[in-house]
Interface confidence: low
């Protein structure tokens, strides 16, 4: 016997009760795949979430979190406060990165200002809570008869611990 | 069943002052994080407030700050929001929720149960 429910297209399901017609998904509801033979439910974007886009009858709604908060997890399925530059989120709440670390972002942890050193360079502009140090030139480089100063080292990727 | 039950609404002239309270059943209270949410007549849902399970975290929306307080009693399984120097534009139907899974930490997993909600006017 032949399953006509593969025929049912997104946005049906297929209804057993009434001889494997396709019907419309419900009201909030939606099949975002053909041959379902139910309509999930749709989420709701409500508390500390906010909706991102509409739900349809072909595609489940997408939250964002609030104002002062950011997602977190697959399909922003937590919501995590955020902290200002020069800060982190610990258990206690917003903390000011401790010396010798930064952070540019609303989110996430204080990293340790780069060691110029260690590539031989010298700290061209010192690191403060919110900004990493930018690193110069090294000494040789500044030696009589040497060639022009190099410039700063660019900047590391937001996220990018040093290495 | 869970179920959760708004009380404390009324009608109260600006500058004053009113506690709202939610009776929680059906869950183990002290595990969730709750959160208050509210309704002005022809707007969307606003999130107001939420409260870790242990009480120790406490997350207020920038146009409550200052203004709201929120807290529970596991003991007696109940929610509150102290609100105080009220404003015309706090008139709404205030909703208290559940957080859909339990957690130690500070994050707020989607709401999953809302209450029936209480009616807040703030006129003069």
């Known amino acids: 016997l032949q399953d006509l429910c593969s025929n049912c297209p997104a946005g049906t399901f297929c209804d057993n009760n009434r001889s494997q017609i396709c019907s419309p998904c419900p009201p909030n509801s939606f099949s975002s795949a053909g041959g379902q033979r139910t309509c999930d439910i749709c989420r709701q974007c409500k508390g500390v979430f906010k909706t991102r886009k509409e739900c349809s009858s072909t595609s489940n709604a997408e939250c964002d979190c609030i104002s002062g908060y950011h997602c977190l997890g697959a399909e922003c399925s937590m919501c995590e406060q955020d902290c200002k530059q020069g800060q982190e989120l610990t258990k206690k709440g917003c903390k000011d990165c401790c010396f010798g670390t930064f952070n540019d972002q609303k989110r996430g942890i204080c990293r340790p200002w780069t060691n110029c050193s260690l590539d031989g360079k010298s700290v061209l502009v010192n690191g403060t809570k919110e900004r990493d140090v930018v690193c110069g030139p090294s000494p040789a480089d500044l030696s009589p008869g040497a060639s022009s100063a190099t410039p700063p080292a660019p900047a590391r990727e937001p996220g990018h611990s040093p290495q | 069943e869970v179920q959760l039950l708004e009380s404390g609404g009324g009608l109260v002239q600006p500058g004053g002052s009113l506690r709202l309270s939610c009776a929680a059943s059906g869950f183990t209270f002290s595990s969730y994080a709750m959160s208050w949410g509210r309704q002005a007549p022809g707007k969307g849902l606003e999130w107001v407030s939420a409260?870790?399970?242990?009480?120790?975290?406490?997350y207020y929306a920038d146009s409550v700050k200052g203004r709201f307080t929120i807290s529970r009693d596991n003991s007696k399984n109940t929610l509150y929001l102290h609100m105080n120097s009220l404003r015309a534009e706090d008139t709404a139907v205030y909703y208290c929720a559940k957080e859909k899974v339990a957690t130690t930490g500070d994050y707020y997993y989607d709401m999953d149960v809302w209450g029936q909600g209480t009616t807040v006017t703030v006129s003069s």
């Open positions: 409260i870790s399970g242990s009480g120790g975290s406490t």
